[in-house]
């Protein structure tokens, strides 16, 4: 039976075996097409999610779909039920926390009182002034906290205590990519990790350790990528893996926060990268130990220069490295997080591509996660 399962797939009606390599090859080999069912699936960007959180103290903003304008949520009459609705609109199922924060002097959006209508937040029609003088600061999930803060140095061995959201994504027990835990059910990674193998069965996630081979594997229920855009083939390098069973969080298994929608990082902002990838460009071997390194945001104009990526870095990507080169992500680090620390750790980028590893004019290129928040929320909502 083990041999059969490893090399063959059972089609139903009529019952017969097909070679496992025919799974998810794009051709319907079983009469009912079930060989193409448990495969990497694409999901469109979907409609605009009508709530979002700002980097200004994680304050809640609500979209008026009639005008397309965004408004800040006033704390007046804001309830736990409204907080849960807001978080559900973003696809979260966990219990949120919220508090009042003072309206700041730089508040540039109109502030409105919030109500609920058919499980979506709405602005109260006859909204008067915000009497409390406070906005809603909302956290849908406790995230981005680790037991240990890394030291700012070049490249060094990492501890899972510092990066409890880091996972190894493996195909047939071989490490292929990194990834980040976003919540008990979901792991964030890069779409290109699944180009070679699009069947879900053989993919596993390993969490909770900084050593590659030493932790139990978790079954994957679904792998979802964003709809492919032929105009920008390198864009949309983002994937979500839904785990078959929710993770139990601990000191070494925790989620990282998604970035705020307005998380604009200026050049030279310090960031962190981690992974088990190659330590040399053509080193041919994964690192057994998780490695960490500090890098910085590199200006997209510089990154797109003639001696660098010549316009291939789009608005949905970002570059990071160090100006003199030598510190970079490499093969095997793909899908892992590019991280920024404010109050919590945020995954601002996903290791995506680059020419070589560590070259001074060709730094690492990362999927800009803030460009895909809408897609992430729509996937989560569809899977709630």
């Amino acid at each position: 039976k083990v041999i059969l399962d490893k090399y063959y797939f059972l089609c139903g009606q009529p019952l017969h075996f097909i070679p496992r390599k025919q799974l998810c090859d794009g051709e319907l080999d079983c009469p009912l097409g079930e060989d193409e069912e448990h495969c990497v699936k694409s999901f469109p960007e979907g409609p605009a999610v009508a709530v979002r959180l700002s980097k200004d103290r994680s304050t809640l903003q609500v979209l008026d779909s009639a005008t397309g304008n965004w408004f800040s949520a006033c704390f007046d009459n804001f309830t736990e039920a409204l907080a849960e609705t807001a978080c559900r609109q973003m696809g979260y199922s966990s219990k949120p926390t919220f508090r009042a924060v003072e309206i700041g002097p730089d508040q540039d959006l109109d502030v409105v009182e919030i109500t609920e209508n058919s499980q979506e937040l709405r602005m109260r029609n006859s909204s008067g002034p915000c009497l409390s003088g406070s906005l809603v600061s909302l956290h849908c999930l406790a995230c981005g906290k680790s037991l240990k803060t890394p030291r700012v140095v070049g490249v060094e061995e990492a501890s899972v205590d510092s990066w409890p959201w880091q996972v190894s994504i493996q195909y047939d027990k071989q490490h292929v990519c990194g990834g980040s835990i976003l919540d008990p059910h979901w792991v964030l990674t890069a779409a290109h990790c699944f180009r070679k193998h699009t069947d879900v069965f053989n993919w596993k996630v390993r969490a909770g350790s900084d050593k590659l081979g030493s932790f139990p594997s978790l079954a994957v229920a679904k792998i979802i990528i964003i709809e492919f855009n032929p105009m920008y083939p390198k864009d949309n390098d983002i994937a979500l893996m839904k785990l078959q069973f929710p993770l139990t969080f601990s000191g070494t298994v925790r989620p990282i926060c998604l970035p705020f929608f307005d998380e604009e990082l200026t050049p030279a902002t310090p960031l962190w990268i981690i992974g088990w990838g190659f330590t040399k460009q053509n080193g041919g071997k994964m690192s057994d130990i998780l490695l960490q390194a500090s890098v910085q945001v590199i200006d997209s104009t510089r990154c797109n220069a003639d001696d660098a990526y010549q316009g291939e870095v789009t608005e949905k990507m970002m570059c990071a490295g160090i100006p003199e080169g030598g510190v970079d992500t490499c093969q095997g680090d793909s899908g892992g997080p590019l991280m920024y620390q404010s109050d919590q750790w945020h995954v601002v980028g996903i290791v995506s591509w680059g020419y070589g590893c560590g070259g001074p004019s060709t730094p690492g290129v990362y999927t800009k996660v803030s460009a895909y928040l809408n897609w992430i929320y729509n996937v989560w909502k569809a899977e709630l």
């Epitope: 794009g26 319907l28 495969c39 694409s42 180009r195 699009t198 709809e227 492919f228 032929p230 083939p233």
Partner: antibody, heavy 119, light 107 residues
Framework: EVQLLESGGGLVQHGGSLRLSCAAS????????LHWVRQAPGKGLEWVSS????????YYADSVKGRFTISRDNSKNTLYLQMNSLRAEDTAVYYC????????????WGQGTLVTVSS | DIQMTQSPSSLSASVGDRVTITCRAS??????LAWYQQKPGKAPKLLIY???NKDTGVPSRFSGSGSGTDFTLTISSLQPEDFATYYC?????????FGQGTKVEIK
């Protein structure tokens, strides 16, 4: 087996309209980018239009923009090309093609359908 | 639009010959280049994508190389079934554009 079967070609007057269809079978239709590519008699290949799996992204060659409309019906496994205001230079064999998963290039093609525009 | 120029336009060769076709882009296209083979009265067939990756089922005698603006398709030992027209195509920017084709004929 992946199959793409174009239909709807034929002779049409200058300024007229035609609707090409491409019936697909043997693959997970709704997961793939689809394309129309044409070839004028004795000439080279010309990309005409592309449509992404859920129709979110649609692109046209400048030569057909505003006159041709690509669409797909994932429930019927069919790709369409609505061609209006046809010109003599639109005379060609029109191929429908399935894009590979990445980078979306046409890797399965139909046998083509001939469109002839008479002036 | 990005112009693709193939050379030669046609060539005559014998079975067993090594054949090289070149394709030049009017601007840098990184590795976003594909090669197709087309036989008379038939639809094109994808051979090579992203400059050097062989599509499934393509014989090992076909290889692609190059990046930026200059690309090459090589048939290491020409077989009778290889006599056809070959097209390069860039997918760096829409509109996707093809070269004018290279016809490989029997000498």
């Amino acid at each position: 087996e992946v199959q793409l079967l174009e239909s709807g070609g034929g002779l049409v007057q200058h300024g007229g309209s035609l609707r090409l269809s491409c019936a697909a079978s043997g693959f997970a239709f709704s997961s793939y980018v689809l394309h129309w590519v044409r070839q004028a008699p004795g000439k080279g290949l010309e990309w005409v239009s592309s449509i992404s799996s859920s129709s979110s992204y649609i692109y046209y060659a400048d030569s057909v923009k505003g006159r041709f409309t690509i669409s797909r019906d994932n429930s019927k496994n069919t790709l369409y090309l609505q061609m209006n205001s046809l010109r003599a230079e639109d005379t060609a064999v029109y191929y429908c093609a399935r894009g590979d998963r990445y980078p979306g290039l046409p890797n399965y093609w139909g046998q083509g359908t001939l469109v002839t525009v008479s002036s | 639009d990005i112009q693709m120029t193939q050379s030669p336009s046609s060539l005559s060769a014998s079975v067993g010959d090594r054949v090289t076709i070149t394709c030049r882009a009017s601007q840098g296209i990184s590795s976003w280049l594909a090669w197709y083979q087309q036989k008379p009265g038939k639809a094109p067939k994808l051979l090579i994508y992203q400059a050097s990756n062989k599509d499934t089922g393509v014989p090992s005698r076909f290889s692609g190389s190059g990046s930026g603006t200059d690309f090459t398709l090589t048939i290491s030992s020409l077989q009778p079934e290889d006599f056809a027209t070959y097209y390069c195509q860039q997918s760096y920017r829409i509109p996707w554009t093809f070269g004018q084709g290279t016809k490989v004929e029997i000498k």
